[in-house]
């Protein structure tokens, strides 16, 4: 888990500026699976590869996000890059987080959790990260993960690091993060829900 996100980022960072622009334009018209929304044009066109990766994963989750990215790359004539992306996403899987009942086998999440949908905004706007870490420690975060997030220098980088672990999380783990957010920054959760 997390491998697909890294593979998407790797592919997008290997595009030239012109290719990245073309990728975004194609993304605006590519056919989507039923039930998935399109990333708004205004936000999309100004994104760099890192922000676009985050947006793809938050809108479409890792599996479908990688598939969609590969389809667009293929449509651009970048067959080899598309093949590499799909090959990278089909290797390996992550361990279950600490303290939560793991499912018998991993399964694609058909519903988008609040945490996934608002990933970019949470990275940008959460300030009380230490409090979140304490709330999640031992339940969702291992000691190693806890220390890795704390080691980051800024709140956005802390949140970005925290979100690097979420692809391995199940629904209940995300619920615990959301609960912690409600308790520490309820105004932010309210604002995002309204949006």
């Amino acid at each position: 888990m997390g491998r697909a996100r890294d593979a998407i980022l790797d592919a997008l960072e290997n595009l030239t500026a012109e290719e990245l622009k073309k990728f975004k334009l194609k993304l605006l018209s590519v056919p989507l699976r039923e039930g998935y929304g399109r990333i708004p044009r205004g936000a999309l066109l100004s994104m760099d590869a890192l922000d676009l990766t985050d947006k793809l994963v938050s809108f479409y989750l890792e599996t479908y996000g990688a598939e969609l990215t590969a389809n667009v790359l293929r449509d651009m004539g970048l067959q080899e890059m598309a093949g590499q992306l799909q090959a990278a996403t089909h290797q390996g899987s992550g361990a279950a987080p600490a303290g939560i009942q793991a499912p018998p086998q991993s399964a694609a999440k058909p519903g988008l959790h609040f945490i996934d949908q608002h990933r970019a905004a949470l990275i940008a706007r959460v300030t009380n990260v230490e409090w979140l870490l304490d709330a999640l420690y031992g339940k969702v975060l291992t000691d190693e993960q806890y220390q890795a997030v704390r080691a980051e220098p800024t709140n956005p980088s802390k949140m970005r690091k925290l979100f690097s672990f979420t692809p391995a999380w199940n629904w209940t783990c995300k619920d615990l993060l959301l609960q912690a957010l409600r308790e520490s920054q309820s105004y932010l959760v309210e604002d995002l829900e309204r949006s």
Partner: antibody
């Protein structure tokens, strides 16, 4: 329309286990959490926990931790609640319930099963 | 866990009167509170969610308000079918908890 149909009433001995089922129809089973709430005779409502069938993960009320197991069978769109080490105070009506929506985990229960009476008696 | 305390335990009113039911939370739950109606032998029925949102199909005489720790369910003019037990429930944090209920009975 959304329907939650529960299994029939059960009479159990203290120390034994009970497994109550909740068959779901009218929506995609894997898209929403399913919760279990119980109500002892003449008493209030008590949340026991939930399962998210999309990934099989479950969360429990710590009061029941170790005694309750909530599972889901995607092939039959059925959720199950098993309670072990039964005692007389577990005599209650057990309800399965589905939230209005699960996206933001605001668990307001808009859809309920008809309830299953579990009587624990020696 | 968050404790919800409902008051009064029993409320005796006549049809046509206004009913005001209260729910107090032991800590701040923002607006994450819902209200249910339950009649004997039936499952609870969602009336209000997120403090003030009226659930689909619920008559407009029901309304909810409040935030933080104090919440109110108001029934503007009681109909005979409104006499039942009412529960509040918080969705702020786990475990989810319910109030002990207010019985609304005919005077």
């Amino acid at each position: 329309q959304v329907q939650l149909v529960q299994s029939g009433a059960e009479v159990k001995k203290p120390g034994s286990s009970v497994k109550v089922s909740c068959k779901i129809s009218g929506y995609s089973f894997t898209d929403q959490t399913i919760h279990w709430v119980r109500q002892a005779p003449g008493q209030g409502l008590e949340w026991m926990g939930y399962i998210y069938p999309g990934d099989g993960s479950a969360m429990y009320n710590e009061k029941f931790q170790g005694r309750v197991t909530i599972t889901a069978d995607k092939s039959t769109s059925t959720a199950y609640m098993e309670l072990s080490s039964l005692r007389s105070e577990d005599t209650a009506v057990y309800y399965c319930a589905r939230p209005l929506y699960s996206y933001a985990s605001y668990y307001w229960f808009a859809y309920w099963g008809q309830g299953t009476l579990v009587t624990v008696s020696s | 866990e968050i404790v919800l305390t409902q008051s009064p335990a029993t409320l005796s009113l006549s049809p046509g009167e206004r009913a005001t039911l209260s729910c107090h939370a032991s800590q701040n739950i923002n607006v994450y509170l819902s209200w249910y109606q339950q009649k004997p032998g039936q499952a609870p029925r969602l009336l209000i969610y997120k403090s003030s949102n009226l659930h689909t199909g619920i008559p407009a005489r029901f309304s909810g308000s409040g935030s933080g720790t104090d919440f109110t369910l108001t029934i503007s003019s009681l109909e005979p079918e409104d006499f039942a037990v009412y529960y509040c429930q918080q969705g702020q944090s786990y475990p989810l908890t319910f109030g002990q209920g207010t019985k609304l009975e005919i005077k």
